[in-house]
Interface confidence: medium
């Protein structure tokens, strides 16, 4: 279920854009980064695609948003929300957040100035 983000700007417009893109490559890319490429994680066989390929696919998907820069925080929040239940301890949560905040830079986008990733009602 999608949470209310209540961000500055037109968050509903960003929400629609985030809904339209496939964030799975981003989620898989980050999981690969924190779990290691040698491991299978839950339902994803993350060995099937190299991390660099996943990163490119992730960046391509983020680029599909009309307002990539403005809606980047909403996209990062949605990735966090989607993967929250898969993160089983504090350390994984910290690593996931760190990798997530590096994502815009990896895709040559500007990082959002303020982006609160603690959006999952205490779940993450």
């Amino acid at each position: 279920m999608r949470r209310e983000r209540g961000r500055q700007g037109d968050s509903s417009s960003c929400e629609r854009q985030v809904d339209r893109v496939n964030l799975k490559p981003c989620e898989q890319h980050i999981m690969q980064r924190i779990m290691g490429e040698q491991e299978q994680y839950d339902s994803y066989d993350i060995r099937s695609t190299r991390s660099s390929d996943q990163q490119q696919r992730c960046c391509d998907e983020l680029n599909e948003m009309e307002n990539t820069q403005r809606c980047m925080c909403e996209a990062l929040q949605q990735i966090m929300e989607n993967q929250c239940d898969r993160l089983q301890d504090r350390q994984m949560v910290q690593q996931f957040k760190r990798e997530l905040m590096n994502l815009p830079q990896q895709c040559n986008f500007r990082a959002p100035q303020r982006c609160d990733l603690d959006v999952s009602g205490g779940r993450c």
Partner: antibody
Framework: EFQLVQSGSELRKPGASVKVSCKAS????????MNWVRQAPGQGLEWMGW????????TYAQDFTGRFVFSLDTSVNTAYLEISGLKAEDTAVYYC????????WGQGTTVTVSA | DIQMTQSPSTLFASVGDRVTITCRAS??????LAWHQQKPGTAPKVLIY???NLKSGVPSRFSGSGSGTDFTLTISSLQPDDVATYYC?????????FGQGTRVEIK
């Protein structure tokens, strides 16, 4: 097999220091944070804090700041708890433990502080 | 700091009984809750992580539920081997807190 093996019992005088080790095996050491837990005789479990095995950043519970230090040696997959300025009330069993889906506990190390 | 309150502190039940232990957090912790079992003279062991996930190797008679502030550990059919003290632990924040423990005994 996922295992945490702790160092043996220690007897120390008040004011001395002690270093407890916790050696991990059967998994990638840097994958899970390491918690430290104290259990005084006949008492419940007290969470002392944890150390991020990836970044080596320790987090201490309020009652365990100052004399307590968490550290790592990732080359030998080992976490350490060092207590300085030991007091009689530090007499307890100290446990290391990981959390999450692979949550596991060490067997405990008894530290006795006595003059 | 988040406080964890367990009840009851001691529980007497017969073999085969359904046993329920509750744990309440002083503020919402989502599902960041674990249940641990400690038998006399031994180290604790993890039964349940993230509120409802049964750790591998733990008998299926143990189950956990809840989210937010209210959590439950249930033993569907109490066995003599289940005599122990049970602790809930929150690990929602970068800190973690244990409940005071519930001693389960056979009556």
């Amino acid at each position: 097999e996922f295992q945490l093996v702790q160092s043996g019992s220690e007897l120390r005088k008040p004011g001395a220091s002690v270093k407890v080790s916790c050696k991990a095996s059967g998994y990638t050491f840097t994958k899970y944070g390491m918690n430290w837990v104290r259990q005084a005789p006949g008492q419940g479990l007290e969470w002392m804090g944890w150390i991020n095995t990836n970044t080596a950043k320790p987090t201490y519970a309020q009652d365990f700041t100052g004399r307590f230090v968490f550290s790592l040696d990732t080359s030998v997959n080992t976490a350490y708890l060092e207590i300085s300025g030991l007091k009689a009330e530090d007499t307890a069993v100290y446990y290391c433990a990981t959390d999450g889906s692979e949550g596991s506990w060490g067997q405990g190390t008894t530290v006795t502080v006595s003059a | 700091d988040i406080q964890m309150t367990q009840s009851p502190s001691t529980l007497f039940a017969s073999v085969g009984d359904r046993v329920t232990i509750t744990c309440r957090a002083s503020q919402s912790i989502g599902t960041w809750l674990a249940w641990h079992q400690q038998k006399p003279g031994t180290a604790p062991k993890v039964l349940i992580y993230k509120a409802s996930n049964l750790k591998s190797g733990v008998p299926s008679r143990f189950s956990g539920s809840g989210s937010g502030t209210d959590f439950t550990l249930t033993i569907s059919s109490l066995q003599p081997d289940d005599v122990a003290t049970y602790y809930c632990q929150q690990y929602n924040t970068y800190l973690g807190t244990f409940g005071q423990g519930t001693r389960v005994e056979i009556k």
